[in-house]
Amino acid sequence: MMTGTIETTGNISAEKGGSIILQCHLSSTTAQVTQVNWEQQDQLLAICNADLGWHISPSFKDRVAPGPGLGLTLQSLTVNDTGEYFCIYHTYPDGTYTGRIFLEVLESSVAEHGARFQIP
């Protein structure tokens, strides 16, 4: 039975040209995290594998930095980066947990962070 929950940074906004940290946290389970995949609309951004460490897709090498923790830092943001991002936690023995983050990249200098929310 999957008892864990994923807490994410939720709906967030950031300025064009700036950086943002995408963060997820898995709680309420003792399952072992074997790998975390970060995706944007079915495209793989990066993997953090428990044994093999961090790996960044060739699509994002110049704009993605690993961490902090199992999170991901997006740099040099463009308006095209607006959209849904997913952290996919592969765990044993529970299986897969998925968290969703919506990022809006703004032209203006006003970029407020949304509240945290949970996905069971």
Epitope: D42, H55, I56, I88
Partner: antibody, heavy 126, light 113 residues
Framework: QVQLQQSGPGLVKPSQTLSLTCAIS??????????WNWIRQSPSRGLEWLGR?????????DYAVSVKSRITINPDTSKNQFSLQLNSMTPEDTAVYYC????????????????WGQGTLVTVSS | DIVMTQSPDSLAVSLGERATINCKSS????????????LAWYQQKPGQPPELLIY???TRESGVPDRFSGSGSGTDFTLTISSLQAEDVAVYYC?????????FGQGTKLEIK
């Protein structure tokens, strides 16, 4: 020893769809340490990477922007192979098409092409 | 896209002599996170697919003779054949696998003088 065996037609009519298959022996299409690619070669374009499919806890694809609107690369785990479909073929798509294994060594998402299929000369002509 | 430019386009070298092929990338293919250079060299003979010689810019593929070596950093790379053999007549390509689309050089044709 890894071997890649290509199959598919050598002649395609303009506007039709090219379908090629690459059968894998000595490795698994679902391997977590390999990526499966299609590349083509022509006198006018040289060697041109088209796209790839790979499994990292789930299946992913990456495609070259130049063909993204008309390409599909699919794995077939039951037959341990992967395929290329390229729609709306034109004479400019005439080339030798290769499948190739990208060995994910040190970086599980990128690597050099260490095994290649024998190549299939595809001519687009009516 | 990263453009890979090889020089020369063709090269004639005497048997037993050194052959040097250059490759320049339009941007760095060094990934600072793991300090790896995402560059490979291939040899292609007529009617055959390319064959991997060198990866990570300087690591020789298993089974490749030690007369083949790769070097370079940043954006400038070199493939060296220390003592040319008759079977080395081929076209040589560099390739970057740093970012999409993966791109190849235009090729250097190596012949015997």
């Amino acid at each position: 020893q890894v071997q890649l065996q290509q199959s598919g037609p050598g002649l395609v009519k303009p506007s039709q769809t090219l379908s090629l298959t690459c059968a894998i022996s000595g490795d698994s299409v679902s391997s977590n340490s390999a990526v499966w690619n299609w590349i083509r070669q022509s006198p006018s374009r040289g060697l041109e990477w088209l796209g790839r499919t790979y499994y990292r806890s789930k299946w992913y694809n990456d495609y070259a922007v130049s063909v993204k609107s008309r390409i599909t690369i699919n794995p077939d785990t039951s037959k341990n192979q992967f395929s290329l479909q390229l729609n709306s073929m034109t004479p400019e798509d005439t080339a030798v098409y290769y499948c190739a294994r990208e060995r994910a060594l040190y970086d599980i998402l990128a690597g050099s092409f260490d095994y290649w299929g024998q190549g299939t000369l595809v001519t687009v002509s009516s | 896209d990263i453009v890979m430019t090889q020089s020369p386009d063709s090269l004639a070298v005497s048997l037993g002599e050194r052959a040097t092929i250059n490759c320049k990338s339009s941007q760095s293919v060094l990934f600072g996170f793991n300090n790896k250079i995402y560059l490979a060299w291939y040899q292609q003979k007529p009617g055959q697919p390319p064959e991997l010689l060198i990866y990570w810019a300087s690591t020789r593929e298993s089974g490749v003779p030690d007369r083949f070596s790769g070097s370079g950093s940043g954006t400038d790379f070199t493939l060296t054949i220390s003592s040319l053999q008759a079977e080395d007549v081929a076209v040589y390509y560099c390739q970057q696998y740093y970012s999409f689309p993966y791109t190849f050089g235009q090729g250097t044709k190596l012949e015997i003088k």
